[in-house]
């Protein structure tokens, strides 16, 4: 079969580092009291720590984070008409990561 002809490459560990992830902008981040609106865009890219550590007692955690305000559009219905309003959502980007013991507290910005 085709599988027996291909040589398996060595597995590489997904190291603990920042990676681009998709973050969903939920409506409750913008307005907890009203459900009759949409948010655009519905998702954005953020940098987040992910990957494996050498043993189970440690986890890939951010050691440095940065808050990034972005402007989104809130689409509301006013007198039957869709009206766009600007809203600000604060995203959290991870700048640096480290394998830390599970009990370790998260860093403060």
């Amino acid at each position: 079969s085709l599988g027996s002809l291909t040589i398996a490459e060595p597995a590489m560990i997904a190291e603990c580092k920042t990676r681009t992830e998709v973050f969903e902008i939920s409506r409750r981040l913008i307005d907890r009291t009203n459900a009759n609106f949409l948010v655009w865009p519905p998702c954005v890219e953020v940098q987040r720590c992910s990957g494996c550590c050498n043993n189970r007692n440690v986890q890939c955690r951010p050691t440095q984070v940065q808050l990034r305000p972005v402007q989104v559009r809130k689409i509301e219905i006013v007198r039957k008409k869709p009206i766009f309003k600007k809203a600000t959502v604060t995203l959290e980007d991870h700048l640096a990561c480290k394998c830390e013991t599970v009990a370790a507290a998260r860093p403060v910005t």
Epitope: F37, I77, R79, K80
Partner: antibody, heavy 123, light 110 residues
Framework: EVTLRESGPALVKPTQTLTLTCTFS??????????VGWIRQPPGKALEWLAN???????YYNPSLKNRLTISKDTSKNQAVLTITNMDPVDTATYYC???????????????WGQGTTVTVSS | DFVLTQSPDSLAVSLGERATINCERS????????VSWYQQKPGQPPKNVIY???QRPSGVPDRFSGSGSGNSATLTISSLQAEDVAVYFC??????????FGGGTKVEIK
């Protein structure tokens, strides 16, 4: 297929009341987000919006004509009716009805129009 | 209240050339609402050619495109065809005013 058709008198006298009927098919005015609007166009001029009526019976009028306009609907007959009181020669125009839809995930657009009915105001 | 001012009033373009129509809003940001464009040929009702600022209804050729920013919106016909000869109207609204039309732009063949 969505179709709309306007009907009413071709000629009215000044001070009279004009009643126009829009009969439509292919959609229902009981469906969430659906509305019917009335628009007019004097000969060789621009379009002018008159009134909208919505699925929930909300009604909106052009502020400059509001005291002369009444819009209503008969959902069972698939009709929307516009009345204009105290007609004047400046109201001579082609009158159109159009389907309009709205909603937070929709667009506020008149996506289907009737052929229009020409109304002349003269004594 | 606001006014939509279209420019130019009329436009003569050679077949295959680009036609651009501007629609300027007197107050408020055009990006706060949707803009639609309508094509009206002589003796016919208006027909929607652009909705939601830049969306094209099915059946409308892709030579028609819409855009907008700040206080103005633009309709572009990338390669004018004989059947595009018509009057074009922009339309918008705001939270208080339900529907406002521009004054229209007549597109002809040069």
């Amino acid at each position: 297929e969505v179709t709309l058709r306007e009907s009413g008198p071709a000629l009215v006298k000044p001070t009279q009341t004009l009643t126009l009927t829009c009969t439509f098919s292919g959609f229902s005015l009981s469906t969430f987000g659906m509305g019917v609007g009335w628009i007019r166009q004097p000969p060789g001029k621009a379009l002018e919006w008159l009134a909208n009526i919505w699925w929930d019976d909300d009604k909106y009028y052009n502020p400059s004509l509001k005291n002369r306009l009444t819009i209503s609907k008969d959902t069972s007959k698939n009709q929307a009716v516009l009345t204009i009181t105290n007609m004047d020669p400046v109201d001579t125009a082609t009158y159109y009805c159009a389907r309009i839809s709205t909603g937070i995930s929709s667009y506020y657009v008149m996506d289907a129009w009737g052929q229009g009915t020409t109304v002349t105001v003269s004594s | 209240d606001f006014v939509l001012t279209q420019s130019p009033d009329s436009l003569a373009v050679s077949l295959g050339e680009r036609a651009t129509i501007n629609c300027e809003r007197s107050s408020g940001d055009i990006g706060d609402t949707y803009v639609s464009w309508y094509q009206q040929k002589p003796g016919q009702p208006p027909k929607n050619v652009i909705y939601g600022n830049d969306q094209r209804p099915s059946g409308v050729p892709d030579r028609f495109s819409g855009s907008g920013s700040g206080n103005s919106a633009t309709l572009t016909i990338s390669s004018l065809q004989a059947e595009d000869v018509a009057v074009y109207f922009c339309q918008s609204y705001d939270s208080d005013i339900d529907i406002v039309f521009g004054g229209g732009t007549k597109v002809e063949i040069k």
